[in-house]
């Protein structure tokens, strides 16, 4: 029995609903009474949702899943997952048994956009060319882990003396703190770019130091 799922991962934003598509080709004369459908976590075989004996057996996964009952008879075994969480990320197997068996796995990739970075400077006053300063770029509540890039006002990448830390909160979302240590020139702009690799979303922050005072656009 051929079971079809998308090859590419399904990308879902945290808090939204996702549809994990799965389909099979019913033979002529097929009735739902013959169908055994199981959605399970691929890595653990933990039951997510099932359909058996012509009846939806319900969600075994935090009551956040649903089938599309009106479409099952046409071979649509897709699963709706509500209020997606970081912990939902992974592979889900769609297992169909009629007379024959078939299964396929679909990947769920969870994502959350990063906030616009906030920039802080230490020390933040009485700065002169030649002083060493620490610039911190902070961006919050994104997923998965971010890629962080620094550059100067001319667009030249700054890779030395950068320390980036990412901490997950209870929901699994990451707060990113990236610290750049730099020796000040006469004046300059320092930009931080926080990229979400799944969403291909960039969040920018910059600080411009022009002698006195400093500006934070």
């Amino acid at each position: 029995l051929e079971v079809q799922v998308p090859e590419d991962p399904v990308v879902a934003l945290v808090g939204t609903d996702a549809t994990l598509c799965c389909s099979f080709s019913p033979e002529p004369g097929f009735s739902l009474a013959q169908l055994n459908l199981i959605w399970q976590l691929t890595d653990t075989k933990q039951l997510v949702h099932s359909f058996a004996e012509g009846q939806d057996q319900g969600s075994a996964y935090a009551n956040r899943t649903a089938l599309f009952p009106d479409l099952l008879a046409q071979g649509n075994a897709s699963l709706r997952l509500q209020r997606v969480r970081v912990a939902d990320e992974g592979s889900f197997t769609c297992f169909v048994s009629i007379r024959d068996f078939g299964s396929a796995a679909v990947s769920l990739q969870v994502a959350a956009p990063y906030s616009k970075p906030s920039m802080t400077l230490e020390p933040n006053k009485d700065l002169r060319p030649g002083d060493t300063v620490t610039i911190t770029c902070s961006s919050y509540r994104g997923y998965p882990e971010a890629e962080v890039f620094w550059q100067d006002g001319q667009g030249v990448p700054l890779t030395g003396n950068v320390t980036t830390s990412q901490m997950a909160n209870e929901q699994g979302l990451f707060d990113v703190h990236s610290v750049l240590r730099v020796v000040l020139g006469a004046n300059g702009t320092y930009s931080c770019l926080v990229r979400n690799p799944v969403l291909q979303q960039d969040a920018h922050g910059s600080v411009t130091i022009t002698g006195q005072p400093m500006t934070f656009p």
Partner: antibody, heavy 118, light 109 residues
Framework: EVQLLESGGGLVQPGGSLRLSCAAS????????MSWVRQAPGKGLEWVSG????????YYADSVKGRFTISRDNSKNTLYLQMNSLRAEDTAVYYC???????????WGQGTTVTVSS | QSVLTQPPSASGTPGQRVTISCSGS????????VNWYQQLPGTAPKLLIS??QRPSGVPDRFSGSKSGTSASLAITGLQSEDEADYYC???????????FGGGTKLTVL
């Protein structure tokens, strides 16, 4: 030809340890879940433990939990069962079995005998 | 006591039809594949039927069916070489374990 070959059984005293191995051949070992099933003399089949294809998920029967450890080495196509604190009631023939995507243990080894006795 | 319930014994004469039942629950047979194994004396178990599917090499005298939380194995045209122990088995979602029936000893009279 798809084959599973168990080894490592023998006579051991109560409280002792033993490590069983199951060498797989003729299929892509790293793609399959695997299980250990045992059969005490004159008794029925009893599932002991199972492990996912990557080794990240493991399951155990209540009767062996905390005493037995299942593991695998996909580079060597080998499944293991480390048995500690053995008891007389662990005496059995131990079979390894391939566990496919459709929840079928479809291929079994010939078994290795474990005897726990003083 | 086994999670899946099978009769301890069954018998028939050559050529007869014999059925063996296996009763479980919604967390195993009710939604998971039910497997039937044949174990000839002194040998390892051999997969016979999964739900109603026969692996290649298994004679079509053997058939399986499943309804609700019960399953049955039927053997038609019974032969002396069918004398063996037969086990049903299924994955159980509540126990996170494989569960077996206690086994049915089939005697060919």
């Amino acid at each position: 030809e798809v084959q599973l070959l168990e080894s490592g059984g023998g006579l051991v005293q109560p409280g002792g340890s033993l490590r069983l191995s199951c060498a797989a051949s003729g299929f892509t070992f790293s793609s399959y879940w695997m299980s250990w099933v045992r059969q005490a003399p004159g008794k029925g089949l009893e599932w002991v433990s199972g492990i996912s294809s990557s080794g990240s998920a493991t399951y155990y029967a209540d009767s062996v939990k905390g005493r037995f450890t299942i593991s695998r080495d996909n580079s060597k196509n080998t499944l293991y069962l480390q048995m500690n604190s053995l008891r007389a009631e662990d005496t059995a023939v131990y079979y390894c079995a391939r566990w496919n995507d459709y929840d079928i243990m479809d291929v079994w080894g010939q078994g290795t005998t474990v005897t726990v006795s003083s | 006591q086994s999670v899946l319930t099978q009769p301890p014994s069954a018998s028939g004469t050559p050529g007869q039809r014999v059925t063996i039942s296996c009763s479980g629950s919604s967390s195993n047979i009710g939604r998971r594949t039910v497997n039937w194994y044949q174990q000839l004396p002194g040998t390892a178990p051999k997969l016979l039927i999964s739900n109603s599917q026969r692996p290649s090499g298994v004679p079509d005298r053997f058939s399986g069916s499943k309804s609700g939380t019960s399953a049955s194995l039927a053997i038609t045209g019974l032969q002396s070489e069918d004398e063996a122990d037969y086990y049903c088995a299924s994955w159980d979602d509540s126990l996170n374990a494989w569960v077996f029936g206690g086994g049915t000893k089939l005697t060919v009279l």
